[in-house]
């Protein structure tokens, strides 16, 4: 019977006849960096070219003793994951090993450094087709492994990592915490976060999806027809490299901000046990689970959008956090959120050439975060209109006056401490689509853009009563751009998006003694593109 | 220690002044930073990762390199370039004492650098 | 201009202490590893022992390991070589020398007899 | 440890000749650590050449050094009276550093 974990990353709605993409990874070479491997083992003999690459630490203790099986068990299991014969993810992808992890599992930044110039050295050498870099293995934070990492995504390769299993914030590790790379958590069987003895994975914004990661079966080094079931973050990154391996072979021309969007838009929502993770953590963690796209689905027509957040910006009164979107991705539109309700919104903000969202907190607040929707979206052009506060009762409004541009998200802003003590707005009056409503004392921006066939709506959903969260959803075939609440008063603690979904939070009203006057609604933008729409039809 | 010989002139250079401000003096505002990994036991101090500003041409990093290893010398101290980068990012890797590391943040064209740490298999 | 001056040299019984001082002076002395480099009458020139800027890292030459002692006031801009144990074979004029041995202390003699 | 033979032990020429001083290592020495030092009678000693070859401040263009690996030389092209003295070459790549036991380079 199939292993569970290859059960579970296949989709839902496949058929059997047709459940492999084409060449199953054939056209893509995914680079393994981890320790020695045993190349002849049956499950990979033959797909694994062994590179002369090897930048590894001695060995800690005097007294270790180099044992080849124990050398090579790590990268032999991983190497069967992504593309063995058997148990592997991608059945067709060449793999190619470069150790720069010891007998112990131990390696360093400076060695994986030299091994990912290698790669990008044998790339401008000998160009093949699309790349795919697995790093199994995780370190303290480090600018420069992020920053190298970061360059050779930019130089057109797919790096996947493990999250770590540290059960803490993969922000904490790297290459884990770099933005371009996929970083990957583990869950297992019951679509729990992998526990690994008193750790388990990591967690967190750093973390754009999960994978199986717990009893995987996969080849074992201790002889060549052995198999082995491990567990551990590793495993999991070697299923999306594996999947990336398969959605690459189908589509070479991806980008990795596509190769990303796609692997977050198949993958099965909200599976995973939240619980498991820390309170704090647990609205940042993607409830992800990466799943193979079904093979007769060119997903080219879809608006594909994710939901970036930011780092926390700290206590101080003036503090910001700033969220960001891949190279290639367009940021539509910018929220913000905090824990204690004491903020001062957010705005959309140009910074070397590229929008960012900003979030800002107040006097007396924990500290804010900004999330920013970043999607896929060609031929875009995106602009800011704001209006300042108007003072006046009826709150500020902001719409898209420019011909063909439409309202994809709105943000506002305010220098008051406590918009709570101010009178709130009556709701967007119906039929103006194109604009953006606000406190009287905020300013309020509208995020508006053209792009061929690009139609949006809004779609409002207000619960009269006080509620401690308000969430509206996107119909299928429309994806969410933009998510802010309705009205901006102090008890709400912010907006942000999950998936196709809108959730709009409050404080709990039992305990800050508001009134049910004070009603919450939550304002969704969904877009679509035509074009893209048309473009797929003329496909298929 | 063994490593490659080193080319001199930068020493040559810095020898020619006995006052110490002149040979050390910086080249620019010394605005380049140090980070070491916030995990202590990870720490591997003694290697470091000599980053240079982006636009820096690819010659500079050998040529970097070699200044730093000069000035070193001149002050006694050993270092050993272990590796110079140009494919990813402009740069080297050195093998020195931690003491040379003001000496190595004053160095033009210098960004950050950052003491080596380790990586686990996960 | 750089200088080097040695003092606290001596006649000293064997089995006795000494400690010898290199006050430098027209050079940022925290920036430079420093040597004590000893030479017996009529002899070749000995490394003895060094010590870096911050005076966290210290070599001896295994003739002294144990007995001789390398260290640094960085305030004073002062080396020290305390030596204990002191044999008949450690007689000789001791130099302090700076960094790549660019500069040299004019020396100090060292005589241990009974 | 690293082993500096020097040869010859004395070299005996006259003002206006050629010297040419030999360093042996008993392993290879980085040569950018490898310096040569004059001395004379009654004085500390005066770096001459450090890095193998290069020049220290003040050393005049006649004193040249060269040589990789595990071979070195000093050569002096045209002996000036105040060249006579004796000569050191020194490692300082390993420790523990190590100086040759000298050529004593004498008026003939």
């Known amino acids: 019977s199939i292993p569970w974990n290859l059960e579970r990353i296949t989709p839902a709605r496949y058929r059997a006849d047709e459940y492999q993409p084409p060449k199953g990874g054939s056209l893509v070479e995914v680079y393994l960096l981890d320790t020695s491997i045993q190349s002849d083992h049956r499950e990979i003999e033959g797909r694994v070219m062994v590179t002369d690459f090897e930048s590894v630490p001695e060995e800690d203790g005097t007294r270790f003793h180099r044992q080849a099986s124990k050398c090579d068990s790590h990268g032999t299991h991983l190497a069967g994951v992504v593309s063995g014969r058997d148990a592997g993810v991608a059945k067709g992808a060449g793999l190619r090993s470069l150790r720069v992890l010891n007998c112990q599992g131990k390696g360093t930044v400076s060695g994986t450094l030299i091994g990912l110039e290698f790669i990008r050295k044998s790339q401008l050498v000998q160009p093949v087709g699309p790349l795919v870099v697995l790093l199994p293995l995780a370190g303290g934070y480090s600018r420069v492994f992020n920053a190298a990492c970061q360059r050779l995504a930019r130089a057109g390769v797919v790096l996947v990592t493990a999250a770590g299993n540290f059960r803490d914030d993969a922000c904490l590790y790297s290459p884990a915490s770099a933005p371009e790379v996929i970083t990957v958590g583990a869950t297992n069987a019951q679509d729990q976060p992998v526990t690994l003895g008193t750790l388990g994975t990591n967690f967190g914004r750093c973390v754009d999806l999960f994978a199986p990661g717990e009893d995987i079966i996969g080849a074992s080094s201790d002889c060549s027809t052995c198999f082995v079931s491990r567990s551990g973050t590793s495993q999991a990154a070697a299923h999306v490299a594996g999947i990336a391996a398969m959605m690459l072979s189908a589509e070479p021309e991806l980008t990795l901000a596509e190769l990303r969007q796609r692997l977050i838009h198949f993958s099965a929502k909200d599976v995973i046990n939240e619980a498991w993770f820390p309170e704090d953590q647990r609205v940042l963690t993607p409830n992800l689970v990466a799943a193979l796209p079904p093979s007769t689905h060119r997903a080219g027509w879809q608006l594909f959008c994710r939901t970036v957040w930011s780092a926390h910006s700290g206590p101080t009164r003036m503090a910001t956090a700033v969220a960001r979107c891949a190279q290639d991705e367009e940021l539509l539109s910018c929220s913000s959120f905090s824990r204690s309700g004491k903020r001062r919104g957010e705005r959309i903000e140009a910074q070397g050439g590229k929008r960012v969202c900003r979030a800002h907190n107040a006097f007396g607040g924990e500290g804010v975060y900004a999330i920013a929707r970043c999607c896929l979206l060609p031929q875009v052009n995106c602009s800011v209109h704001t209006a300042p506060p108007a003072g006046a009762s009826m709150g500020t409004r902001v719409h898209c006056h420019q011909q063909g541009h439409v309202l994809t998200g709105c943000s506002s802003h305010w220098e008051v401490e406590d918009l709570g003590t101010h009178k709130p707005p009556v709701l967007r009056p119906r039929g103006q689509p194109n604009q953006c409503v606000g406190h009287r004392e905020a300013s309020i921006h509208a995020s508006c853009c053209h792009a061929p066939g690009l139609e949006c709506k809004v779609k409002e959903h207000g619960i009269p009563a006080p509620q401690e969260q308000v969430i509206v959803a996107c119909e299928d075939g429309w994806t969410l751009t933009g998510c802010s609440p309705l009205p901006g008063t102090s008890h709400v603690l912010g907006a942000y998006a999950v998936d196709n979904t809108c959730v709009v939070r409050s404080r709990d009203v039992s305990t800050t003694g508001s009134t049910s006057k004070e009603a919450v609604a939550a304002v969704a933008i969904c877009c679509r593109s035509r074009h893209l729409v048309q473009a797929s039809q003329e496909l298929q | 220690q063994e490593d490659e010989d080193g080319d001199y002139e930068e020493l040559v250079l810095a020898l020619r002044s006995e006052e110490d401000g002149l040979a050390d003096a910086p080249e620019h505002g010394a605005t380049a930073t140090f980070h070491r990994c916030a995990k202590d036991p990870w720490r591997l101090p003694g290697t470091y990762v000599v980053v240079l500003k982006e636009e820096t041409h690819r010659s500079q990093s050998e040529r970097t390199a070699r200044r730093l290893q000069a000035q070193a010398a001149r002050r006694g101290y050993l270092t050993k370039i272990l590796h110079v980068f140009h494919h990813l990012l402009p740069g080297f890797l050195v093998k020195m004492s931690g003491d040379l590391l003001e000496l190595a943040l004053k160095l033009p064209h210098v960004d950050y650098i950052e003491e080596d740490s380790s990586v686990f298999a996960q | 201009q750089v200088q080097l001056v040695e003092s606290g040299g001596g006649l000293v019984q064997p089995g006795g202490s000494l400690r010898l001082s290199c006050a430098a002076s027209g050079f940022t002395f925290s920036d430079y590893y420093m040597h004590w480099v000893r030479q017996a009458p009529g002899k070749g020139l000995e490394w003895v022992s060094n010590?870096?800027?911050?005076?966290?890292?210290?070599y001896y030459a295994d003739s002294v390991k144990g007995r001789f002692t390398i260290s640094r006031d960085n305030s004073k801009n002062t080396l020290y070589l305390q030596m204990n144990s002191l044999r008949a074979e450690d007689t000789a004029v001791y130099y302090c020398a700076r960094g790549m041995f660019d500069f040299w202390g004019q020396g100090t003699l060292v005589t241990v007899s009974s | 440890d690293i082993v500096l033979t020097q040869s010859p032990a004395t070299l005996s020429l006259s003002p206006g000749e050629r010297a040419t001083l030999s360093c042996r290592a008993s392993q290879s020495v980085n040569s950018n650590y490898l310096a040569w030092y004059q001395q004379k009678p009654g004085q500390a000693p005066r770096l001459l050449i450090y890095?193998?070859?290069s020049r220290a401040t003040g050393v005049p263009a006649r004193f040249s050094g060269s040589g990789s690996g595990t071979d070195f030389t000093l050569t002096i092209s045209s002996l000036e009276p105040e060249d006579f003295a004796v000569y050191y070459c020194?490692?300082?790549?390993?420790?523990?550093?190590?100086f040759g036991q000298g050529t004593k380079v004498e008026i003939k």
């Open positions: 020194q490692q300082w790549g390993d420790v523990p550093i190590t």
């Open positions: 010590i870096s800027g911050s005076g966290s890292t210290t």
């Open positions: 890095g193998a070859s």
